[in-house]
Interface confidence: medium
């Protein structure tokens, strides 16, 4: 008779894929275009992501400093009005995107939470909480939260408020934190709290410390579900070499919870590579004539068309994982173990019930290493065959589909693998 | 700790059988590829024979192929070698020892002395 | 089969010294991804095998630092720069680039 089936967890839709955010609309869309009328006309492009969820925002009314002049419950007309935004809701629910509203109050200031006044800002929120639900969004996020004092007794009642809605809604709160301790008591009053932070930046980008940044940080949050990113806010390319990129992709694809990202994340959009752009928010690359100021700054490579048309682009490897990510069940809630793989090397194996597994290696290093997988490190239920098919490589020159022999694995510099492999009972 | 202890041997019969176990503590025997390494009395190492972590794989040292069977019971968390049709140059201390992956034998047993001699 | 032969097989040392013994296998042990699969142990009296240097040149975890392998293809070194009287046993040299793997015959370091 054939073993039962393990019963599936229940699944939110934050559970299923990737968040996107866009900080910053006009920068998202290029030079002074950005609105939300226009956005509207990019969620094709973030289907083809296969993202579950839009981050947007701000987007109220907020005089910089100026909390009277802050209105939780306006957009600012520079982005559009209420019925565009309707409008975008309605638009992103066909295609199955989810709109998570950014109502971090004081974003064009100094202190995201107008410091001296922070009680009359947290009523700001819960009112905006009960306007923005009963218009439709899938959720919040809130930034800066160390800014915010008594933060956990805050984000609480701002999640019963979220929560008491529906079960369905999303609460997410950022911090620039990388402290684990700091981290870990703001989840503790919070269960469905998502919370992004700078912990994984924090890092000497080895595979000996990220492994254990991750099994510290799995270890300290128990059973609860968990985001992954490298800040609160910020691009990739702004914490990550260059050649690291793909390797972290291809990590924050298949650890186990919510990866979140950037607008740019998938092309490598780097902050201030170009002259004139403001750090904080960098103007997309939509094609070579997003920069039309200075001809030839923007190259075909850097671009989302010249790399959607290039297979061995970033933003070929993003889609491809965003689809893995979104369809496998071992990748979707699979368990998760670690275990050693030798210096410079990070490697874990998702496995769920009788599902596909699967085996990621990554070499955080900048030298060619054989992956002595030590597979004594697992448990029986997740032990590895003599070989895995290839799913893909972050480096070109592998082909997708070949079996590989696990025992003798070569990785090249900084080079991550995926590999798939049958469940034998 | 982590350690492995073969038992099973003992004097035999040319043309006798024996079967040398090894048993893991510390680790999951299950997720390891595992090898079988013989000494003879004041001679070197000899490489016998190895299994894959699932037990689909196996290989032999022509001296032995034919004659001997490596086998596993996961469960029991158990290495195993079936020596049949056994002569006297098999007489030797057989070890057995886990395979890190593409790289070395990490961990050896301290071996069980087989003796065939009429 | 590939064939590993030693040198030399009997090794007299001076506490403080330094030894070297060779290792030569009959065909090439460089792996197409470019490591050597090539390991030493070493066997101290009524012990089992410990291993030393793995893939070529790799020192295993809590292995001195006074040994060290070199070599690539089929000709292959291991070195001790000062050898202390822990390091009697015999020396073997193992491919794992194919089944069946083979050792060499082994080398005695002695203390003079």
């Known amino acids: 008779r054939a073993p039962r089936c393990r019963e599936l967890p229940a699944q939110k839709w934050w559970h299923t894929g990737a968040l996107y955010r866009i900080g910053d609309l006009q920068a998202f869309q290029g030079h002074g275009s950005g609105n939300l009328a226009g956005l509207k006309g990019r969620l094709d492009y973030l289907s083809s992501l296969k993202v579950k969820g839009l981050v947007l925002g701000p987007l109220h009314k907020n005089q910089k400093d100026d909390v009277a002049q802050t209105d939780l419950l306006q957009i600012d007309p520079n982005f559009g009005s209420k019925e565009d935004f309707d409008n975008l809701l309605q638009s992103a629910k066909k295609k199955s995107i989810r709109v998570i509203l950014d109502l971090t109050p004081n974003y064009r200031g100094e202190n995201l939470w107008f410091s001296t006044q922070v009680d009359s800002v947290a009523t700001k929120v819960k009112d905006a909480l009960e306007f923005w639900l009963q218009a439709g969004v899938d959720g919040f996020q809130v930034r800066d939260i160390e800014n915010l004092k008594d933060a956990s007794s805050f984000l609480a009642e701002w999640e019963n408020i979220t929560k008491g809605f529906s079960e369905d809604r999303l609460l997410i709160a950022g911090t620039n934190s990388s402290d684990l301790q700091q981290i870990v008591s703001l989840l503790e009053s919070n269960k469905d709290l998502l919370l992004t932070s700078s912990y994984l930046s924090d890092s000497s980008f080895t595979g000996e410390h990220t492994k254990s940044l991750v099994t510290q940080y799995l270890n300290a949050t128990g059973n609860r579900w968990c985001s992954w990113s490298l800040s609160q806010a910020g691009l990739l390319t702004s914490f990550l070499p260059a050649q690291l990129l793909r390797l972290y992709q291809l990590m924050l694809f298949t650890l186990p919870g919510t990866p979140v990202f950037s607008y740019g994340d998938e092309i490598g959009l780097k902050a201030a590579a170009l002259p004139g752009q403001p750090v904080e928010a960098p103007v997309m690359l939509w094609d070579e004539s997003s920069f039309p100021d200075i001809p030839g700054a923007v190259s075909a490579n850097m671009t989302v068309k010249g790399q959607s048309e290039d297979p061995g682009s970033l933003l070929s490897l993003f889609r491809q994982l965003s689809d893995q990510r979104s369809k496998e069940r071992s990748l979707l809630h699979g368990d998760f173990h670690t275990f050693s793989s030798g210096p410079g090397l990070f490697s874990y194996i998702r496995h769920w019930d009788q599902n596909e597994r699967f085996l990621v290696v990554l070499n955080f290093g900048d030298v060619g290493l054989s992956a002595g997988l030590q597979a004594s490190d697992l448990p029986a239920s997740a032990s590895l065959p003599t070989k895995a098919d290839l799913v893909l490589s972050t480096q070109p020159g592998r082909e997708e589909g070949s079996p590989l022999e696990l025992e003798r694995l070569k990785l090249e510099p900084h080079e991550g693998l995926l590999l798939r492999f049958p469940y034998v009972a | 700790e982590v350690q492995l202890v073969e038992s099973g041997g003992g004097l035999v019969q040319p043309g006798g059988s024996l079967r040398l176990s090894c048993a893991a503590s510390?680790?999951?025997?299950?997720?390891?590829?595992m090898h079988w390494v013989r000494q003879a009395p004041g001679k070197g190492l000899v490489w016998v024979s190895r299994i894959n972590s699932d037990g689909s794989s196996t290989s032999y040292a022509d001296s032995v192929k034919g004659r001997f069977t490596i086998s596993r019971d996961n469960a029991k968390n158990t290495l195993y070698l079936q020596m049949n049709s056994l002569r006297a140059e098999d007489t030797a201390l057989y070890y057995c020892?886990?395979?890190?992956?593409?790289?070395?034998?990490?961990?050896w047993g301290r071996g069980t002395l087989v003796t065939v001699s009429s | 089969d590939i064939v590993m032969t030693q040198s030399p097989l009997s090794l007299p040392v001076t506490p403080g010294e330094p030894a070297s013994i060779s290792c030569r296998s009959s065909q090439s042990l460089l792996h197409s991804h470019g490591d050597n699969y090539l390991d030493w142990f070493l066997q101290k009296p009524g012990q089992s095998p410990q291993l030393l240097i793995y893939l070529g040149s790799n020192r295993a975890s809590g292995v001195p630092d006074r040994f060290s392998g070199s070599g690539s293809g089929t000709d292959f070194t291991l070195k001790i720069s000062r050898v202390e009287a822990e390091d009697v046993g015999v020396y073997y040299c193992m491919q794992t680039l194919e089944t069946p793997y083979t050792f060499g015959q082994g080398t005695k370091l002695q203390i003079k």
């Open positions: 020892a886990r395979w890190n992956w593409g790289w070395y034998f990490d961990l």
């Open positions: 510390g680790f999951t025997l299950s997720s390891s590829w």
